[in-house]
């Protein structure tokens, strides 16, 4: 027994308390001081005395104590048996209860486990399904990647072969370039040799030119003498003719006194037999107004009426509208024939225009227009040109279609600026256009980067001012 206590209660009786697990048992036992003696027969129902007998001697007392002890032992044995019986029953009950309780708990736990297992199984099924889906998707991706890889591999192979081809081509070209370089070096060498030869030739030519210049000076002097002689001869011939006409006037009525033949242009002068270059008086049909013009009777078959000439910068070409209308300058030198005369002349029949140009390096070029005419003053003497040929540029340096004429006091151009004021001279300015043969005259070595000079763009570019220009006209059918 786990716990066994002996104590005294308030009425003097002995109290025994047994503790077993959660159960507690209490037994009340009578005092054994006046119990029967051991010699007396045992009577189970004998009444106990309330007051004990007193013995004087210790032996008797010891006897009594022994009896009490024996009695106590019997009681304890009975109690033990009783407890054991009771405990067995109780233990059986407790065990039964415990088993029942545990079974219930076990069933509950089992149920929970089953539920959890079912839940887990369901989750596992879901996961399995997901895994399957994922696996399928991955398999597809893998297949796609595999295909893509194959495709890329093929492309790489193609590119590799292409690279190889290009490398072959490149090496071939490199060889070719090297060969060309060698060839180029040889050519350069030969060019250098040619250049040296040319320099020798040029120096020879320079000395020849110097000699020729000297001869020209001599020839010019001789020419002047010859001209004087010719002039004298002409005077003599004229005098003779006058004398003859005077003496024959009565006999020949067809030559009236004071009669004068008029020419509209130099082509007519040429056709009349005057085939010498020089200044001639021209008159328009049905007009009394005369103009003096220079006639070129040699160039390209002759018969050319010069309408403009620049040669030395001796005449100022920054003139007014009126001056350009009627003309100005010196016909045997620099001059402008006059817009009005040219307009009327070119509207009576078809004319060609030839523009002859000279640069400061001794080069010459020309532009020939197969049809040329000027509008009237009311239309600002607008220029009309067709059919360009020549060596002074494949494109016309006079803007097409033609522009109105502008002067410093008549701004008819297409620029927000005033071209005539800025570039100087009267011209058929556009905005401002590729040409101006009436610009400022600049001497040699001062003729580049000049924007207001004598310009013909499609021969010499924008900033080059020319040495000389001549504008000439002639009937188209001449």
């Amino acid at each position: 027994y786990n716990n066994f206590r002996k104590s005294m209660d308030s009425i003097g009786k002995k109290q025994y308390q047994v503790q077993h697990g959660s159960c507690s048992y209490t037994f009340l036992l009578p005092e054994m001081d006046n119990c029967r003696s051991s010699s007396s027969p045992y009577v189970s129902n004998a009444v106990q005395r309330d007051a004990p007998l007193e013995y004087d001697d210790s032996v008797q007392r010891l006897q009594v104590l022994e009896n009490i002890m024996e009695n106590n032992t019997q009681w304890l044995m009975k109690l033990e048996n009783y407890i054991q019986d009771n405990m067995k029953k109780e233990m059986v009950e407790i065990q039964q209860n415990a088993v029942q309780n545990q079974t219930a708990v076990m069933i509950e736990i089992g149920t929970n486990l089953l539920n959890q297992t079912a839940e887990q199984t369901r989750k596992l099924t879901d996961v399995e399904a997901q895994v399957l889906n994922q696996t399928t998707r991955l398999e597809l991706q893998l297949l796609e990647h595999s295909l893509s890889t194959n495709k890329l591999e093929k492309q790489i192979l193609d590119q590799t072969s292409e690279i190889n081809k290009l490398q072959d081509k490149n090496s071939f070209l490199e060889k070719k370039v090297l060969a060309m370089e060698d060839k180029h070096i040889i050519q350069l060498q030969s060019i250098k040799e040619e250049k040296d030869q040319l320099q020798v030739l040029v120096s020879k030519q320079n000395s020849i030119i110097e000699e020729l210049e000297k001869k020209i000076v001599t020839a010019t002097v001789n020419n002047s003498v010859l001209q004087k002689q010719q002039h004298d001869l002409m005077e003599t011939v004229n005098n003779l003719l006058t004398m003859m006409s005077t003496s024959n006037s009565a006999k020949d009525p067809t030559v009236a006194k004071g009669e004068q033949i008029s020419f509209r242009d130099c082509a007519e002068v040429f056709k009349s037999g005057h085939t010498t270059n020089g200044v001639y008086t021209l008159t328009l049909p049905n007009s009394t107004e005369e103009v003096k013009a220079y006639c070129d009777m040699e160039a390209g078959g002759g018969g050319w009426t010069i309408i403009q000439r620049r040669e030395d910068g001796s005449v100022d070409f920054q003139r007014t509208w009126k001056e350009y209308k009627v003309g100005f300058g010196n016909p045997s030198g620099e001059y402008w024939l006059g817009n009005e005369f040219v307009s009327q002349l070119t509207n009576q029949q078809r004319y060609v225009l030839k523009i002859h140009l000279k640069d400061w390096e001794g080069n010459e070029a020309y532009s020939l227009y197969e049809h040329f005419y000027l509008s009237s003053e009311e239309l600002n003497y607008r220029i009309h040109l067709k059919g360009l040929t020549g060596t002074a540029g494949k494109i016309s340096s006079i803007s097409q279609p033609g522009n109105d004429f502008s002067t410093k006091d008549a701004d008819n151009d297409k620029c927000i600026c005033k071209c005539s004021q800025m570039l100087t001279g009267g011209w058929w300015f556009d905005a401002c256009g590729p040409s101006n043969l009436n610009g400022m005259y600049y001497p040699q070595r001062q003729n580049t980067n000049k924007f207001n000079g004598i310009k013909w763009y499609y021969w010499k570019g924008s900033g080059y001012s020319l040495k000389g220009t001549t504008m000439m006209i002639r009937p188209a059918g001449f």
Epitope: S399, C432, G433, F451, K455, Y457
Partner: nanobody
Framework: EVQLVESGGGLVQPGGSLRLSCAAS????????MSWVRQAPGKGLEWVSS????????YYADSVKGRFTISRDNSKNTLYLQMNSLKPEDTAVYYC????????WGQGTTVTVSS
Amino acid sequence: EVQLVESGGGLVQPGGSLRLSCAASGFTFSDFGMSWVRQAPGKGLEWVSSITWSGGSTYYADSVKGRFTISRDNSKNTLYLQMNSLKPEDTAVYYCNADHPQGYWGQGTTVTVSS
């Protein structure tokens, strides 16, 4: 329609600086060389500076060499002239000009250098 519009002119003291601009339109600006040309009061046109179509080469009149700088921005169709250490003799109307067959010109911008 072709247009060249100069700007940036004004009154400046001797030794001062100005930057002229020329905005181009109506033609392919980047295909042509460009120039600055000036006209002093009562005088003729004087070439100042030129630049090639790409801006790779520049050229200057002796009178402005070392003081003026020409440049261009083909993406903005604009020509520039940076003028430093200005002198009274730089007083003029400044024109930009395209090295084009037409020789396009603007209306000019006036630069006055005076104390």
